[in-house]
Every structure is written in structure tokens, then in C-alpha cells.
């Protein structure tokens, strides 16, 4: 059976396509190619007489067609108007004609696309942004890329207009991109230049650093305030409610106890119109802001119940501190047998009873800090009663 095949089936505009003929009968007078799905003299492209080896152009000939002795038809410099069906009619020497129809599709070489946006400076959690991939072309697939990855599944991302438009609902600061669109057809593909979003947001609640609260007299107080914000926030400082200065950093040299108080950082974004504040308490004191870990010792760790006594001692090199004791997570003393002495440095238990067995630890603290010792284990034993060795009467 007479058949035709397009090589290639999908053709780039400006390129060429060859309509190949298979199973051409042997004894022929000639053949004709037509544009369309049927033989129509008004749409004849070319005829070829085998006897004279002469090609005759038809009404639909554009000058770009070449017919070969094997009936194949070459069309050069194709346009999108060439897309469609082509019919070959073979005039056989028995005067019975055969026909075969083939087709091909011409696609344009796609240009480099560009991205247009309805809002390039959206406000976080408030605005939506619609990106559109330009130009609009027929038979084209539109793809989108965010951060060089295909679109994630998200209820905030919507595709429309044949995927040509990407809408971000309620943008966040993480939606800056970059965004790229890609257009594809069966013969070409092209990607746009990246586009980034300038998402306006903030300020978030400011953070004051360093995190220290306690300072010694004579030290320099240097505080820095930062709030995530776009555009960057404008900062101001208040001490105990009184405005000080409009800077991101606050510096006070050689502080005294009089500089103790509440330090407020105020962050403002003039575009969003939002303000945020953070308050930090600063304490200037001679007291050590950090208390060292105390050591705990016992006069003995294994004692005999109802007989022995024990002394537990909590040692520290810090001054201006207080000491408290704990047994099984409970504060001591918890009974008449327990006594504290030497400024709570020593815990005495006399006499020790079975219920006194367990872990003990001490804690040292001042108004601004505290620390606790490692636990110590107290074991309480009781002497066993002597066994009676008697023979039972036999």
C-alpha cells in the first residue's frame, strides 16, 4: 500500500521537510502532490511526468517545493502556514490511481521569553503577585522555575491562562525567587532571564544583643538592635521610657549602677508603616553575675542507721552568696535530726535513719545567679540480728 512519511514530523519554521513515499508502484505515468487531505486541482503543488522526467508546478506551488523521481517531495524554508495534510496521487499505467495522505506540523523557533509582573514590590502577607510569561504563542508549553527548581506543590501558587500566568497568593519574604519561565514546543525551548521579587516586610520583633543582663560598674555598655525588615528598619533607643538616640547601636562608656534600668529598642519600617519594640533590663552591680559550681563532701557516705551521724559540707570560693540544701528534690532541713550551721555551709544529720538514705546536693546563689553541686549518695545500713543455732529434738 502506498504510504507517505514526513521527515521530520515536527518541523522548525525556516527548516525543511521531506515527504517520503513508501511502496511506490512500479509502472507509473506520473504523480501529483496536493495540499490537503484530498485531490484538488486548485491545490496541486506539483506534478511529475515520468516519461519526460518533467515537473510541472501547480496552483499551490510556492517555489519552495522540489519533487524527486521517487515521488518524494521536499519543502524548504517552511512556514507555519505549511502545517497540515499533503496528498500524493500516483497515476499508474493501468489507469487506476492510488492516493496517500501524510502530514507534518511546523512550529516556530521560540524566542527568549520574558516575565512581566503586576507588582514588583509586594507587601508580605498582604499582596498577591501575578507573573506572566511573554510572549503568548500557539502550541506552546509554559513551565515555571523557582530557585532553579520546578514549582513546589503549594496552595499559595496558582497557574492559569494555560500555565502562562503564575500567581503567588499572600507573598512571604521567602518568595523573592529568582523566578524563570520556560517556553517549549516540539522543536525548541527557551528560558527567560531570572526575575526576583522585592518583598516588603517587617519589622519583626527586634533582638537586642548581646544577651547579657548584668554588668559591673566601670564597664562599657554596647547594645545593638536588629529587626528583620525590608526595606531595613529605622532604629531608636529609649532608656526608662526616655528617648535617647536614633541609631542601631547604643554605646554608654564607664557605666555606674545609675545606668541600670529598662532599655527599649524601637524598630520602624516606613514602607509597611509597622513598628516593633523590645525591652531589655540592664543591671549594673558588683555582684558576680556567674556563681561557680560548689563542691559537696560527706564525713562518711555509708553509715549505720540509728547509731551514726553524718556531716555534709558545701564549699564555694564565691562571696556574697547564700546556700541551700536539697534531698530527693526537697528543700532541707526536713526534720529535727537535721541541723544547718556555719551559714548553711554544713548539714548535720543526727542520728541517721533509714529514710535518710538517698541523694543530697547543695545550691549556691546570689540575687543574679545560682549554681548547684553534683549530687552525693548517702547509704544507710542496719546490723542484722544474731541467728540462734539450736538443735531440734530428734
Amino acid at each position: 500500500q502506498l504510504t507517505t512519511e514526513s521527515m521530520p514530523f515536527n518541523v522548525a519554521e525556516g527548516k525543511e521537510v521531506l515527504l517520503l513515499v513508501h511502496n511506490l508502484p512500479q509502472q507509473l505515468f506520473g504523480y501529483s502532490w496536493y495540499k490537503g487531505e484530498r485531490v484538488d486541482g486548485n491545490r496541486q503543488i506539483v506534478g511529475y511526468a515520468i516519461g519526460t522526467q518533467q515537473a510541472t508546478p501547480g496552483p499551490a506551488n510556492s517555489g519552495r517545493e522540489t519533487i524527486y523521481p521517487n515521488a518524494s517531495l521536499l519543502i524548504q524554508n517552511v512556514t507555519q502556514n505549511d502545517t497540515g495534510f499533503y496528498t500524493l496521487q500516483v497515476i499508474k499505467s493501468d489507469l487506476v490511481n492510488e492516493e496517500a495522505t501524510g502530514q507534518f506540523h511546523v512550529y516556530p523557533e521560540l524566542p527568549k521569553p520574558s516575565i512581566s509582573s503586576n507588582n514588583s514590590n509586594p507587601v508580605e502577607d498582604k499582596d498577591a503577585v501575578a507573573f506572566t510569561c511573554e510572549p503568548e504563542t500557539q502550541d506552546t508549553t509554559y513551565l515555571w522555575w523557582i530557585n532553579n527548581q520546578s514549582l513546589p506543590v503549594s496552595p499559595r501558587l496558582q497557574l492559569s491562562n494555560g500555565n502562562r500566568t503564575l500567581t503567588l497568593l499572600s507573598v512571604t519574604r521567602n518568595d523573592t525567587g529568582p523566578y524563570e519561565c520556560e517556553i517549549q514546543n516540539p522543536v525548541s525551548a527557551n528560558r527567560s532571564d531570572p526575575v526576583t521579587l522585592n518583598v516588603t516586610y517587617g519589622p519583626d520583633t527586634p533582638t537586642i544583643s548581646p544577651s547579657d543582663t548584668y554588668y559591673r560598674p566601670g564597664a562599657n555598655l554596647s547594645l545593638s538592635c536588629y529587626a528583620a525588615s525590608n526595606p531595613p528598619a529605622q532604629y531608636s533607643w529609649l532608656i526608662n521610657g526616655t528617648f535617647q538616640q536614633s541609631t542601631q547601636e547604643l554605646f554608654i562608656p564607664n557605666i555606674t549602677v545609675n545606668n541600670s534600668g529598662s532599655y527599649t529598642c524601637h524598630a520602624n519600617n516606613s514602607v509597611t508603616g509597622c513598628n516593633r519594640t523590645t525591652v531589655k533590663t540592664i543591671i549594673v552591680t558588683e555582684l558576680s553575675p556567674v556563681v561557680a559550681k560548689p563542691q559537696i563532701k560527706a564525713s562518711k557516705t555509708t553509715v549505720t542507721g540509728d547509731k551514726d551521724s553524718v556531716n555534709l559540707t558545701c564549699s564555694t570560693n564565691d562571696t556574697g552568696i547564700s546556700i541551700r540544701w536539697f534531698f530527693k528534690n526537697q528543700s532541707l532541713p526536713s526534720s529535727e535530726r537535721m541541723k544547718l550551721s556555719q551559714g548553711n555551709t554544713t548539714l548535720s544529720i543526727n542520728p541517721v535513719k533509714r529514710e535518710d538514705a538517698g541523694t543530697y546536693w547543695c545550691e549556691v546563689f546570689n540575687p543574679i545567679s545560682k549554681n548547684q553541686s553534683d549530687p552525693i549518695m548517702l547509704n544507710v545500713n542496719y546490723n542484722a540480728l544474731p541467728q540462734e543455732n539450736g538443735l531440734s529434738p530428734g
Epitope: 505515468f29 506520473g30 486548485n42 511526468a49
Partner: antibody, heavy 121, light 111 residues
Framework: EVQLLESGGGLVQPGGSLRLSCAAS????????MSWVRQAPGKGLEWVSV????????YYADSVKGRLTISRDNSKNTLYLQMNSLRAEDTAVYYC??????????????WGQGTLVTVSS | QSVLTQPPSASGTPGQRVTISCSGS????????VSWYQQLPGTAPKLLIY???KRPSGVPDRFSGSKSGTSASLAISGLRSEDEADYYC???????????FGGGTKLTVLG
């Protein structure tokens, strides 16, 4: 069944005009080249004109060029011959004939019964 | 005068083989296909041979065609009385851009 039926012949004065028609049936008219062939009384066959299946290619015998015009209406399956400036030597039976080879191996496989044109004063 | 030359007449008895010649030039017979037509008295011509030697369906194989150079021949074997008719050769002429016929040969079946 293939049929070709000519009409429009008759008596006409020299210099006059006539239009012949050939109604085709029994085949796909638009797929075939068509010709007019004439035969003067007692004489041999003389080819007059041919028109391709789409009407894009037309040829005439030197003896009729400029006076006779061939045309076709594929929607009506009809072939025409417009005859102007007629002369006595145009007197003949006019046949329409089908070429099944689209002109690649010109031949006439079916003929009409003919229509007589007489040019006389 | 016809472009293709045929003998004006030919004759033969029933059962005989008769040959009719047709002479032309390189612009017609030499480079194009030859056809032969039979015209019975008072009727339209009928195609007997096309493409030099091919017979349409329905034409008896007593009719055969051949071509050599710028000449063609129609042979009728086993001649019958109903073969009495005028016979024309025809071909496309590339110089004239038109179809040309021979002057015709009147075949008589003697009887």
C-alpha cells in the same frame, strides 16, 4: 458508469459565438484533465484544447488560439468551450474527452457522443 | 496536413493480421506516449491502445501496439468484420504544446 454529454451546438453565422458544455457523471470530475476534440464532416480528428484537473494549466491548438476558450466548473462537473469569431472551418462535431493520466501520458479513455457546430451564413 | 502520418487506408480478409503505421518526430512519438483510437461509423472514437502498447480493460487482445523510435504501429490479428472502422494514432507534441492526431486510416475487411 462514466458519461460525457455535450450540448450547445447548432447553426451560427461566421463571426458569431457559441458556448458548448460537457456534463460529466460517473467519476470524480475534478480529478481529471479534460479536452475538446473536433471532427469536420468526413475528415479526421483534430485536438482543440486541454484543461488540467484544477484548471491551472490550459493549452490550445494553434488554429483556435485567441478565439476559443476552455474552462471548467468542478463544483458543477461541467466542461465548457466558449467559441468566438467563428469561421466556416470551425464547422465540426465537437467531442469532450477525458484524460485519465492527468496529462502524464496523454490519452482519451472516454468520449462524449459529440455536438455539431455549423458555421454558415 | 496532419503532424502524424498514417496510411489513408488498409484492408484485410477475416482472420488475417493487419498492421497500421504511424510516423512522427522526436517531439511527439519519439519522446511521448502513443495512443490508438477506433471510430466506428457514426460513433464517437474509442480508446484501443494507450502508452504505446497498453490495452484498456474490455479491449480484445487481438489489438496490440508497439513503438520504435519515431514510429508506432497498431496490429490487429484475427481480423473480424466488426473491425471495419477508422483508426487514429495520437500523441502529445512537446514543440506544439498540444495533442496531435494522425490523419486516420480507413480499415476495410474484405469479405
Amino acid at each position: 458508469e462514466v458519461q460525457l454529454l455535450e450540448s450547445g451546438g447548432g447553426l451560427v453565422q461566421p463571426g458569431g459565438s457559441l458556448r458548448l458544455s460537457c456534463a460529466a457523471s460517473g467519476f470524480t470530475f475534478s480529478n481529471y484533465a479534460m479536452s475538446w476534440v473536433r471532427q469536420a464532416p468526413g475528415k479526421g480528428l483534430e485536438w482543440v484544447s486541454v484543461i488540467s484537473h484544477g484548471g491551472g494549466s490550459i493549452y490550445y491548438a494553434d488554429s483556435v488560439k485567441g478565439r476559443l476558450t476552455i474552462s471548467r466548473d468542478n463544483s458543477k462537473n461541467t466542461l465548457y468551450l466558449q467559441m468566438n469569431s467563428l469561421r466556416a472551418e470551425d464547422t465540426a462535431v465537437y467531442y469532450c474527452a477525458r484524460d485519465p493520466t492527468k496529462g502524464y501520458a496523454p490519452t482519451f479513455d472516454y468520449w462524449g457522443q459529440g455536438t455539431l457546430v455549423t458555421v454558415s451564413s | 496536413q496532419s503532424v502524424l502520418t498514417q496510411p489513408p487506408s488498409a484492408s484485410g480478409t477475416p482472420g488475417q493480421r493487419v498492421t497500421i503505421s504511424c510516423s512522427g518526430s522526436s517531439s511527439n512519438i519519439g519522446n511521448n506516449y502513443v495512443s490508438w483510437y477506433q471510430q466506428l461509423p457514426g460513433t464517437a472514437p474509442k480508446l484501443l491502445i494507450y502508452a504505446d502498447s497498453k490495452r484498456p480493460s474490455g479491449v480484445p487482445d487481438r489489438f496490440s501496439g508497439s513503438k520504435s523510435g519515431t514510429s508506432a504501429s497498431l496490429a490487429i490479428s484475427g481480423l473480424r468484420s466488426e473491425d471495419e472502422a477508422d483508426y487514429y494514432c495520437g500523441a502529445w507534441d512537446a514543440s506544439l504544446n498540444g495533442y496531435v492526431f494522425g490523419g486516420g486510416t480507413k480499415l476495410t475487411v474484405l469479405g
